[in-house]
Every structure is written in C-alpha cells, then in structure tokens.
Amino acid sequence: VPRWRQQWSGPGTTKRFPETVLARCVKYTEIHPEMRHVDCQSVWDAFKGAFISKHPCNITEEDYQPLMKLGTQTVPCNKILLWSRIKDLAHQFTQVQRDMFTLEDTLLGYLADDLTWCGEFNTSKINYQSCPDWRKDCSNNPVSVFWKTVSRRFAEAACDVVHVMLNGSRSKIFDKNSTFGSVEVHNLQPEKVQTLEAWVIHGGREDSRDLCQDPTIKELESIISKRNIQFSCKNIYRPDKFLQCVKNPEDSSCTSEI
C-alpha cells in the first residue's frame, strides 16, 4: 500500500541535497584554512538531525543547535555586511573586499545558500517532492528556521559600524518583513554596534534621486535610532563603478561620487 505523503505548496528538497551540503563543506574548509578542523561528516549529520523525521512545520531553533555549535566561526565583528533583496551584488562586493563578510561567506551560510530541504514526520526520508511554503503552509519550516537562526546569531555578533546593502529598485527599499527587517535589525546589540550604515543601490542608469530620503529608509532610521544605534545612509548611484572602484581604488575615475 503506497504511503500517503503530505503535499506542500513549496518546491521540494534540492536534488543531491546531502551531496551538495557535504561537498560545499569540504570546499569551504579547503579555501578557509582556519576552518580546517571542521569534520564535514559531523556537520552533515548535525544538519540532517535538525529536520529528518520531524514534522516540517514544527522545526525550532533548538533543532539547529548541534549544527550551530559545529559551525561556530569567528568573523571580525566590525566587518559585517548585511543585505536585503540584493544578494548577488553583496556577494560580489565581499569577493573583492575580502576582509568583509556576508552571512553566506560563513560556513553555515555557504552550506545552505539557495538550497531547499525538508523531511517527514516519523520517517528518515528527505522529501524531494514538496516542502512547506513560508506563507501558504507554515513559517516554522526547516529552511525558514535555519535562516532565522543563523541571521540572528550573525547580527548578534556584529560590532562598531555595520553595513547593509539595500535594493533601491524595489518599492520597499527597506522591508520590515525581510530577514534583515524582521530579524537582523532587532538583534544588533546597541552596546556593541555604534552605527548602521545603509548603502542604497540604484538600478537606473540616470537615477540621481536621493533614495536615502525614501520613506522606508526613514522608517529604518527611526527603528535603529530607537534602539540607540546611530544611522547613516549613502546612495550608490553606479553599482558597476562602485565594484570596479573597490577592486581598483587607485583608478582616477574613482574619486568622484559612485
């Protein structure tokens, strides 16, 4: 008799999920010698243990604690770059500015970025057919709880000046419902973080508006100020030039505004 399987609204687990996580872990430890001590098989076992045989709408941060412990990593707390809705540029930036880190430049973020996973209650199977959608099914699903957990820890670790890259092409440049707006903003520690500096990335070639005056940026400023953290904002009018100038700061064209 075929076993009835729960149909969720979201895509199923990424194909080759175990192999991908394990391979990413091995690669990460190779390219980050300071993490060479990490046992990737143990990391995978802890990752698997967080969601296998558990109802995929009933996952808790506690489920991920063994993985968090194995993935403990010290990044310079004053070199953290947060981002919202502009991941690719943030990753390109830290690729060039190698002393700065996004969450996805840490081991745990590198393992999971762009992957989907879930299991089933009372079976050791991974569900490759469907996984819960955050909106349509439930918020306490394996992927959402993972990112909430690692994002909270990442924000809590930040100090001094924290940078955030925001997408100026979106209707809500700052979105209270994004991971940045709902988790990271509220977990910056005022006793450690002096300033949150927003970089608003412009999309249009001829867009010379000051997007730091956008109502949603003012809302962000208000939230941050109420938490006793200073706020500053910069327009990045030409993201392509910005990246080029990070790469080659001595270039003569890099003295003007970007």
Epitope: R16, E19, V21, H91, K247
Partner: nanobody
Framework: QVKLQESGGGLVQPGGSLRLSCVAS????????MGWYRQAPGKQRELVAY???????NYADSVKGRFTISSDNAKNTVYLQMNNLKSEDTAVYNC???????????WGQGTQVTVSS
C-alpha cells in the same frame, strides 16, 4: 558536465619557471571558482591557488609570491605561472572547476611537474 583540458607540465630545474594552462568548457560565473590542486607522492592533495568569477586570486601560503593565477574569461582559460620553483613543488597538478550551486568538483586529467637538477 564541465570538461577541463590541461597543458604545460614538465621537468624544470630549481629556480626555474613553468606555466600551466587549463581550458574549461564553461566560464566561471557566480560563486564558482577555478583553480589548481597538487598531489605529491605519499602526500595529501592540497589546494595551490584558485580564482573567482571576478578574477580575485587566492593562494596557499606555500606558493605566495612565487605563483600567480590568472584567467582569460574570453577563452575560459585559467593560467598558473610558477616561478622560483623548488623541489617540494614536484607533484601532479590538477585543474579544478568548483560548481557552487550544484556542489560539484570537476577535474582535469592532471599534469606532472618535476623540479630537479
């Protein structure tokens, strides 16, 4: 499936130079990287150098200042310029393409580099 074709190994005296080339069937993009590993007899494979999609180079401490990795995106080719070679650089050098999204390593067939007088 990424295919890799290496060239440029050989025998060289200590202090000499060699240039390895590796042509890939796919360009480096996104978070993928291309680079070189080496394995000497009886030793573990080690990462020598790799380059990112934006052309950012990274090196093992043992080769810093002597080896230079570079890429020609138009030709999907990565080069490893090896100067001031030492006997401990003797190994089989393997070109590697790391596909981040798929979590897959692709390998060339390997090319022997021997540093000896």
């Amino acid at each position: 499936q990424v295919k890799l074709q290496e060239s440029g190994g050989g025998l060289v005296q200590p202090g000499g130079s060699l240039r390895l080339s590796c042509v890939a069937s796919e360009r480096i993009f996104s978070r993928n990287t291309m680079g070189w590993y080496r394995q000497a007899p009886g030793k573990q494979r080690e990462l020598v150098a790799y380059i990112t999609s934006l052309g950012i180079a990274n090196y093992a401490d043992s080769v810093k200042g002597r080896f230079t990795i570079s890429s020609d995106n138009a030709k999907n080719t990565v080069y490893l310029q090896m100067n001031n070679l030492k006997s401990e650089d003797t190994a089989v050098y393997n070109c590697n393409y790391w596909h981040y999204a798929a979590g897959r390593d692709y390998w060339g067939q390997g090319t022997q580099v021997t540093v000896s007088s």
